[in-house]
């Protein structure tokens, strides 16, 4: 009871002057509050509160539910309390069966005793099951039993308060502990696709998956740099306790070019926030853009291989691809494949494999591709480099020696005179006339060059060499001369191949 010091307000006095009182069920509770400035009695148990404005609290026939704390308050706001136990052998515990705990926090199992003289006040598992090994608790007869540092593993744990009364173990009604998880990480968010490419009028639909320990995770779709509320649909599942998944689907039923932009799926919990974005590009119509991977003018040596390679962007998906040469479509020798297996891939590769090219196979090779909206093509000009071939080497009636050579690039023809029997023809002879014969003909294939010299310039026996050469190689033809008197006579010409 409070001690009184004169001059300053003191708390009320209670009779009987005890901190605790034990009353048998059915007997009277009589409590007197002594204070000149009495205001009220308050009774509290299990979050229930009753008030009485009389200075004497009387309960004629006490019941177990009258167990609790009785507080007398005066006009100065000062108070004194007494705790009354109403001992009822048939009702040892008062219970509030709702039991919730927050992970890592303590929680109170509300089962205060009606008899403080019982022993072994503790918790027990239902149906004789043991409590979790790490479950620690602290009993308090007036409040109940506090479970220390609640774990997730205790969720839906069934338990009883227990006490030994006159040598017998008594159990309370059962409690089911519901554990609210602590958010110990940000939500896990993912998006169905990182980017979307659509044509005007097509539907845009994107799904964000949010995973967390509770459905109390907040999530929303936002458009970057916009406050407009977006329309979303949700689906959610509990994959067991503390394993929650929500799918938030954002839909624009008929996308417009100005819907293009970045959309963010944002989620947060009490730990923090996370987000993931997706990019939408809406085009007014489909497109195809072709990028050659090699120069579109190709020079290749006779007999060698070349690969014509293009990359192209196509949206929507390409429907027809073909390689064409001289109005002929290739049925094999080419392949077409997506640049990546990614679902949103719009980039493709096409390769035409030309093998052991002949001089006659130069020309324009065209790649054509189309989708439902557009067609596109790219041409490669293929030039086959061939060493010169001497087509004709003749002595004309007018005394001219003529050499005609074909090759690519355009051959150059040089003339040499070898006097007598010398093998090396070093003295060069200037031609009288040089003509490119097919300069106005087809743009690919061999170029034909004709060169002539005047044989009257030669006064001695010997050999005339016509040498045709280009970057690839050289070929020679020879004219043998012998003088009989004043007559110049051409011995059969012959050619020598010089690689």
């Amino acid at each position: 009871q409070p001690s009184v010091s004169p001059g300053e307000p003191s708390p009320p006095s209670i009779h009987p002057a005890k901190s605790e009182l034990i009353v048998r069920v059915g007997n009277e509770i009589r409590l007197l509050c002594i204070d000149p400035g009495f205001v009220k009695w308050t009774f509290e148990i299990l979050d229930e509160t009753n008030e009485n404005k009389q200075n004497e609290w009387i309960t004629e026939k006490a019941e177990a539910t009258n167990t609790g704390k009785y507080t007398c308050t005066n006009k100065h706001g000062l108070s004194s309390s007494i705790y009354v136990f109403v001992r009822d052998p048939a009702k040892l515990f008062l219970v509030d069966r709702s039991l919730y705990g927050k992970e890592d926090n303590d929680t109170l199992v509300r089962c205060p005793l009606t008899d403080p003289e019982v022993t072994s006040y503790s918790l027990k598992g239902c149906q004789g099951k043991p409590l979790p090994k790490d479950l620690r608790f602290v009993p308090d007869p007036k409040a109940g039993i506090t479970i220390k540092s609640v774990k997730r593993a205790y969720h839906r744990l069934c338990l009883h308060c227990s006490a030994d009364q006159e040598g017998k173990s008594v159990l309370s009604d059962k409690f089911i502990l519901k554990v609210r998880p602590a958010f110990k990480a940000v939500p896990v968010v993912s998006v169905s696709k990182a980017s979307y490419l659509l044509r005007e009028g097509e539907e845009f639909t994107v799904t964000c998956t949010i995973k967390d320990v509770s459905s109390s995770v907040y999530s929303t779709w936002k458009r970057e740099n916009s406050q407009t509320k977006l329309q979303e649909k949700y689906n959610s599942w509990h994959h067991g306790d503390f394993n929650y998944e929500r799918q938030a689907t954002l839909t624009i039923s008929s996308a417009r070019v100005n819907d293009s932009g970045v959309f963010m799926c944002y989620a947060n919990n009490t730990f923090g926030s996370a987000n993931v974005t997706t990019t939408l590009e809406v085009v007014d119509k489909g497109f195809i853009n072709i990028f050659p991977m090699i120069n579109t003018t190709v020079f290749v040596n006779d007999g060698e291989n070349v690969d014509l390679i293009v990359e192209y962007e196509a949206f929507p998906k390409p429907e027809h691809q073909q390689w064409i040469y001289m109005n002929r479509t290739f049925t094999d020798k080419w392949e077409d494949y997506p640049k990546s297996e990614n679902e949103s891939n719009i980039r493709y590769v096409s390769e035409l494999h030309l093998t052991r090219l002949k001089g006659t196979e130069g020309g324009t090779y065209t790649f054509l591709v189309s989708n439902s909206d557009v067609n596109a093509s790219i041409a490669f000009n293929v030039y086959v480099n061939t060493k010169p071939e001497i087509l004709t080497y003749d002595r004309l009636v007018n005394g001219m020696l003529q050499c005609v050579a074909a090759g690519f690039p355009e051959p150059t023809i040089d003339w040499y005179f070898c006097p007598g029997t010398e093998q090396r023809c070093s003295a060069s002879v200037l031609p009288v006339d040089v003509q490119t014969l097919n300069a106005s003909g087809p743009p690919f294939g061999k170029l034909v060059v004709q060169s002539s010299i005047d044989s009257s310039a030669f006064k001695h026996n010997g050999t005339v060499e016509c040498k045709a050469y280009n970057d690839v190689g050289k070929t020679s033809a020879y004219f043998n001369f012998a003088f009989k008197g004043n007559n110049k006579e051409q011995i059969h010409p012959h050619t020598l191949f010089t690689p």
Partner: antibody, heavy 119, light 106 residues
């Protein structure tokens, strides 16, 4: 024992809003899941949404998304449900119940609040 | 949403009868199924939670069974106070209730 005490009946005009309260007496209100379930005359039960006050974020049934707002005031142990753009088919008894989120069963119910929407 | 189909929608029985009500989910809900009893003009009352656990204070004549998609509520011996409407409810996804089964006196 804990009780859920709901506000009284309401008569509302179409297009208006209604806000119903649900006060919990005792217990650890902040950790409860408080849900709202409605029942139209002669019909079944329909979950509208719920909230765990300690976490603050409400969950809503897809049907009511954007039209219902559920809040909770931990200081007064009271949950609220506001339904906007009322139409005649919203005439129903609106129950608050403990449970309904994170797989909690509805183990405690309020007595219900009749909301009549009529012009 | 997960659809909950209850059958029958109504049944007539006599005191002492064994009554069985079934509830089928449109997809698996594990054991996240609860049963409620509702009397006219009253709020529903929880009978069974987690498919088979009896709520405190509910008479032992009520029992529940099942998991996945098929569930059953059984009243072993119908009592006069059991005439009411019974609802099942799933809690794995956005909460949905079955359409109800009205148990009437024969």
């Amino acid at each position: 024992q804990v009780q859920l005490v709901q506000s009284g009946a309401e008569v509302k005009k179409p297009g208006s809003s209604v806000k119903v309260s649900c006060k919990a007496s005792g217990g650890t209100f902040s950790l409860y899941a408080i849900s709202w379930v409605r029942q139209a005359p002669g019909q079944g039960l329909e979950w509208m949404g719920g909230i765990i006050p300690a976490f603050g974020t409400a969950n809503y049934a897809q049907k009511f998304q954007g039209r219902v707002t559920i809040t909770a005031d931990e200081s007064t142990s009271t949950a609220y449900m506001e339904l906007s753009s009322l139409r005649s088919e919203d005439t129903a008894v609106y129950y608050c119940a403990r449970g309904g989120l994170d797989t909690d069963e509805f183990d405690l119910w309020g007595r219900g609040t009749l909301v009549t929407v009529s012009s | 949403d997960i659809q909950m189909t209850q059958s029958p929608s109504s049944l007539s029985a006599s005191v002492g009868d064994r009554v069985t009500i079934t509830c089928r989910a449109s997809q698996s809900i594990n054991s996240y199924l609860n049963w409620y009893q509702q009397k006219p003009g009253k709020a529903p009352k929880l009978l069974i939670y987690a498919a088979s656990s009896l709520q405190s204070g509910v008479p032992s004549r009520f029992s529940g069974s099942g998991s996945g998609t098929d569930f059953t509520l059984t009243i072993s011996s119908l009592q006069p106070e059991d005439f009411a409407t019974y609802y099942c409810q799933q809690g794995v996804s956005d909460i949905t209730f079955g359409g109800g089964t009205k148990v009437e006196i024969k």
